[in-house]
């Protein structure tokens, strides 16, 4: 399977709420000998390999932020540490995998990735990523509601293949 | 501080089953984001990942392995096992228990490892 | 499986030295690569993970790099206490390690 990332670059004022998406594409198995382990964190956008280095969103590390799940499941961190920060990752049946952030500031600006491990018991398991940059507008300048630019197909860090 | 411990015979006679148990202190093996894993190290030679569980119990095995290894666990007693049948002399090395982060990937927690001698 | 080729095999420096071992995967591992370290009659310890990620507590003369199928842990400057055994091992799939790289002082 592979994850794709819909949009590329989110454009939001201060203040705004944003739901960053990842999705997984291709064949993705949903019985019930299949485990998802996902999760989000901010990275740098490096010179050879983006989301290398794992840095936290709003203090909580990828850990505290993973969602896992049968592959017939939904998910969402329900957990009160994520929502004190104004954080919560959900993930659907379709495949959808996202992060809501509540109350954009300034300093939330910056790279953001998806992590997605799927656990095939008895067989095997395969790891892949996805990058999207989240900048963070105030004043004049800054559109009224976030303005979301989508991933071109060629974009090859934004798509990773198992 | 989680701590792993292994135990077991350090003898085992040619073409018997070897029997290993990983005991699993300062932290749960019910955790939901762990592999629990065993790896091996001839004298001398590299390492060679033989298996892992999921607290679940499901497992995956090393494929020139599979034929001859279980990992059972049991999360009463916070322990999993190695069992290894038909042993011959190059099954002879040091075992590890592991624990491996399923989000970070690698193995970051080790136990010190006991050496097994197959040998009649 | 994915096949894991380390080199050197093994190395003898002095002391301030820049060591720099590679190791090379059999197929695209994106950057699931992780650098122990084995001291004689001790368990691996886990150094670097995501090929350039340093785990809680290393020194920072330890670092690693690469992507794809090619990649370089660097010991900056040697220290007496940094003579051991080098492992790389990949997680994109099932777990695989290279064959280590021994690293002595001259």
């Known amino acids: 399977f592979k994850v794709a990332t819909p949009y590329s670059l989110y454009v939001c004022p201060e203040g705004q709420n944003v739901t960053l998406t990842c999705r997984l594409l291709g064949p993705v198995d949903k019985g019930h000998d299949v485990t998802f382990y996902k999760t989000w964190y901010r990275s740098s956008r490096g010179e050879v390999q983006t989301c290398s280095e794992r840095r936290p969103i709003r203090n909580l590390t990828f850990q505290d932020l993973h969602l896992h799940h049968g592959g017939h499941q939904a998910a969402n961190t329900s957990h009160d540490l994520a929502q004190r920060h104004g954080l919560e990752s959900a993930s659907d049946h379709h495949g959808n995998f996202s992060i809501t952030m509540r109350n954009l500031t300034l300093l939330d600006s910056g790279l953001y990735c998806c992590l997605v491990v799927e656990i095939r018991h008895h067989h095997s398991e395969h790891r892949v990523h996805g990058a999207m940059e989240l900048q963070v507008q105030t004043g004049k300048d800054a559109p009224s509601n976030c303005v979301v630019y989508p991933s071109s197909s060629q974009d090859s860090e934004n798509i990773t293949a198992a | 501080q989680l701590q792993l411990q292994e135990s077991g015979p350090g003898l085992v006679k040619p073409s018997e089953t070897l029997s290993l148990t990983c005991i699993v202190s300062?932290?749960?093996?019910?955790?939901?984001?762990?592999?629990w894993g065993w790896i091996r190290q001839p004298p001398g030679k590299g390492l060679e990942w033989i298996g892992s569980?999921?607290?679940?119990?499901?497992?995956h095995y090393n494929p020139s392995l599979k034929s001859r290894v279980t990992i059972p666990v049991d999360t009463s007693k916070n322990q999993f096992s190695l069992k290894l049948s038909s042993v011959t002399a190059a099954d002879s090395a040091v075992y590890y228990c592991?624990?491996?982060?399923?989000?970070?990937?690698?193995?970051?927690?080790w136990g010190q490892g006991t050496l097994v001698t197959v040998s009649s | 499986d994915i096949q894991m080729t380390q080199s050197p095999s093994s190395l003898s420096a002095s002391v301030g030295d820049r060591v720099t071992i590679t190791c090379q995967a059999s197929?695209?591992?994106?950057?699931?690569l992780t650098w122990y370290q084995q001291k004689p009659g001790n368990a691996p310890k886990l150094l670097i993970y995501?090929?350039?990620n340093l785990h809680t507590g290393v020194p920072s003369r330890f670092s690693g790099s690469g992507s794809g199928t090619d990649f370089t842990f660097t010991i900056n400057s040697l220290q007496p206490e940094d003579v051991a055994t080098y492992f790389c091992?990949?997680?994109?799939?099932?777990?695989?390690f290279g064959g280590g790289t021994k690293v002595e002082i001259k």
């Open positions: 592991a624990r491996r982060d399923i989000l970070t990937g690698p193995f970051d927690y």
């Open positions: 300062g932290g749960s093996i019910s955790s939901s984001g762990y592999y």
């Open positions: 569980i999921f607290y679940s119990g499901n497992t």
């Open positions: 197929q695209d591992i994106t950057n699931y």
């Open positions: 995501d090929a350039s």
């Open positions: 091992q990949q997680y994109d799939n099932l777990p695989t």
